[in-house]
């Protein structure tokens, strides 16, 4: 017997095609067939219009084996058409179809929306032999139905290679709607005017959207969906959700967070990687970003001198890595360095200032009054010069550099001699008899080698020649001297 | 365009109703809600309360419940505010108007003046 | 009930002048709506959800505000702007109407 099976009267199909009947339940039961002793009889429900003339693939059988009568064509019952149920409910149909005893080996498939059901669904035939004819009644079952399960169902059955193949049975699993687009998390410029987006599905239709904002509905008549909620702008963050009506209920949308672009905080943790005497390698923790990408940073690098101007000096640089060589500094010298960056509203304060020192650099002047002669032994160049007039900066002389280039007969030799920073005279062996030597010279701090003199050029002779005359740095803009003897 | 137009005009003597009418036109009337805003004499607006025109539900604000009924013809699109046992602080010009997101009042009918007097 | 508080009740202003018209909500609201009204005339939209000009309505007009402080401002008055103009808040039921500024002509 049905229990609760109520037809219902559709103002429009849900679905293609002719819905022989219509059937909605939270129960749904099937009707009594007449049943052998000891089975438990398949349910199923009765025709929704058994007189209406069937328009699906029939079989049209050829003549009995006796040759007197054709016999009527094969054709499944009519049943119902349209099954509307709540998701999560059990659900139970059929199809039958009567078969006369001369046709052997018959098998019946169910078929969803053109394709074939295989495996492991609840699909049970059953068989109830006559006299004449085979009742075939082919059930499907889904227990706890979900929206997937929505969709057309048709039995089909092969009798000598020919299809027949049932009225479709339409399965609507209806629920709480079913969000397609949430919002969607955003960092919008402030009282600027940006969108929303929000669309549910049943079924049941219609889906009807609320609007909230900070647990305030927006609107406050519903709004067929899809929606777009154009927010007219913001001076502080806010959160946004959208609410799915339909005749089931409601289901709420995640809410997301609508934060306002600011100014980045300011960098903090500046720190000293490596200094050296004009250059100085910092690094920073960036910080908060206003929720908008940083675009570049700004170094500002302050010289702490009294006697300084006070101008800062200010070296762009990209927002990441987090570091930046400082160049073009005085060496031994105290600087105070900030950074700060930007996004696209603006630049963020300046990170707390932090001292560096530059190292004491290299000489940055050579030595001077360079001269250059034999000694009376013939077997020593003696070397005199002046000490350079260095800056603070350069640090404390350590000595001298002394490069002697010896040439002969294309063949040239360089050496390198290191003095102490008391002296300002040296003596050199003579290498090579018959030769050029050309000296220069260059003061040295803990900061490195600083340039070295001009050239100056003494003929060593062959043996047997004397002579004491020097050879001397020139006077800026004359050529290099050259003693000949 | 869009128009909200109301009746005209009400004298009425204390303890009998009135029935204002307020006839939108120029938009899907069910679509958005009609808000009442009463104005007495020399005062200010003072919200009254409103109507949903999709499901015919009236919400009143504090103040507006009993003697005041909100009510809608959605064929053809017109909204009424009913007062009933009128009493002369009744007396005031009501305007309907339309309400959009945020709760803003978009557009305005012309008012109705209902004078309350024995 | 939200509580709008508008002052000046009234201002006196010669065209030309910046008006400055404030309302001050007795809790945080979400956005703030402004209306004109003239003698024996219905209200007319002015500033939607804070800082919006409603359609037709002239840029000397601008809204600003968030929280409890919002404000209305004229930049130079002309004199057709003499008028009450009322607040309106939107965040929670019921919708409630400051009491009103009069701008009156010096």
């Known amino acids: 017997a049905i229990t609760e099976a109520r037809e219902e009267a559709k103002p429009y199909p849900l679905f293609p095609g002719p819905l022989p009947g219509s059937l909605q339940t939270d129960h749904t039961s099937l009707l009594s067939l007449p049943h052998t002793s000891g089975y438990q009889p398949a349910l199923m429900f009765s025709p929704t219009q058994p007189g209406r003339p069937y328009t699906g693939n029939v079989a049209i059988p050829r003549v009995t084996s006796a040759g007197s009568k054709l016999l009527p064509p094969l054709a499944f019952k009519h049943t119902v058409g349209h099954i509307i149920l709540s998701e999560h409910k059990d659900v139970k149909f059929n199809c039958s179809i009567s078969v006369p005893n001369i046709y052997q080996d018959t098998t019946i498939s169910w078929w969803k929306d053109g394709k074939e059901l295989l495996g492991a669904h609840h699909a049970i035939t059953q068989f109830y032999p006559d006299d004449e004819v085979t009742a075939i009644i082919a059930s499907f079952s889904i227990t706890s139905v979900q929206r997937s399960d929505n969709g057309s169902y048709i039995c089909k059955m092969k009798i000598n290679n020919e299809e027949i193949v049932s009225d479709p049975i339409y399965i609507e699993v209806q629920g709480l709607p079913h969000f397609t687009k949430q919002p969607e998390s955003m960092n919008v410029t402030r009282n600027t005017a940006f969108n929303l987006t929000c669309q549910a599905v049943g079924p049941p239709e219609p889906v009807n959207i609320f609007w909230v904002q900070n647990s305030s509905r927006v609107n406050e008549q519903p709004e067929k969906s899809p929606s777009v909620l154009t927010v007219p702008g913001l001076t502080e963050m806010a959160v946004f959700s959208c609410e799915a009506h339909n005749d089931k209920g409601l289901t709420v949308s995640k809410g997301v967070q609508i934060n306002i672009k600011a100014i980045p905080s300011p960098p903090t943790e500046v720190s000293i990687h490596n200094s050296t005497a004009h250059s100085i390698l910092i690094s920073w923790v960036p910080g908060f970003d206003g929720y908008s990408p940083f675009r570049n940073c700004s170094v500002q690098v302050k010289e702490v001198d009294p006697l300084s101007n006070g101008s800062v000096m200010i070296f762009n640089t990209s927002a990441s890595p987090h570091m930046y060589q400082i160049k073009q500094l005085q060496a031994l010298a105290n600087y105070s360095i900030g950074v700060s960056c930007m996004n696209e509203i603006g630049w963020s304060a300046v990170s707390p200032w932090i001292l560096a020192s530059t190292t004491e650099g290299a000489p940055s002047v050579a030595p001077l009054n360079v001269t250059v002669f034999l000694n009376e032994s013939r077997d020593n160049v003696d070397i005199r010069w002046m000490k350079p007039l260095t800056k603070r900066q350069a640090g404390e002389l350590v000595g001298y550099r002394i490069s002697h280039v010896w040439q002969s007969a294309g063949i040239s030799k360089e050496l390198l001699e290191e003095v102490g920073q008391n002296n300002s005279r040296a003596q050199i062996s003579v290498q090579v008899h018959n030769a050029t030597c050309t000296v220069r010279i260059a003061a040295v701090t803990k900061g490195g080698v600083g340039p070295f003199s001009d050239p100056v050029k003494i003929f060593i002779p062959a043996h047997g020649w004397v002579d004491h005359a020097p050879s001397s740095t020139p006077a800026p803009g004359n050529a290099d001297p050259v003693l000949i003897i | 365009q869009v128009q909200l137009v109301q009746s005209g005009s009400e004298l009425k003597k204390p303890g009998a109703s009135v029935k204002v009418s307020c006839k939108a036109s120029?938009?899907?009337?069910?679509?958005?809600?009609v808000h009442w805003v009463r104005q007495a004499p020399g005062q200010g607006l003072e919200w009254m309360g409103w109507?949903?025109?999709?499901?015919?539900?009236?919400t009143y604000a504090q103040g507006f419940t009993g003697r005041f009924v909100f009510s809608l013809d959605t064929s053809v699109s017109t909204a009424y505010l009913q007062i009933s046992s009128l009493k002369a602080e009744d007396t005031a010009v009501y305007y309907c108007?339309?309400?959009?997101?945020?709760?803003?009042?978009?557009?305005w009918g012309q008012g109705t003046l209902v004078t309350v007097s024995s | 009930e939200i509580v709008l508080t508008q002052s000046p009740a009234t201002l006196s202003l010669s065209p030309g002048e910046r008006a400055t018209l404030s309302c001050r909500a007795s809790?945080?609201?979400?956005?703030m709506h402004w209306y004109q009204q003239k003698p024996g005339q219905a209200p007319r939209p002015l500033i939607y959800?804070?800082?919006n000009l409603a359609s037709g309505i002239p840029a000397r007009f601008s809204g600003s505000g968030s929280g409890t402080s919002y404000t209305l401002t004229i930049s130079s008055l002309e004199p057709e702007d003499f008028a009450v103009y009322y607040c309106?808040?939107?965040?929670?039921?019921?919708?409630?109407f400051g009491g009103g500024t009069k701008v009156e002509i010096k």
């Open positions: 120029g938009y899907t009337f069910a679509n958005y809600g």
């Open positions: 108007t339309r309400g959009a997101r945020y709760a803003y009042m978009d557009y």
């Open positions: 109507i949903n025109t999709y499901q015919g539900e009236p």
């Open positions: 959800a804070t800082s």
């Open positions: 309106q808040q939107w965040s929670s039921n019921p919708r409630t």
């Open positions: 809790s945080s609201v979400g956005y």
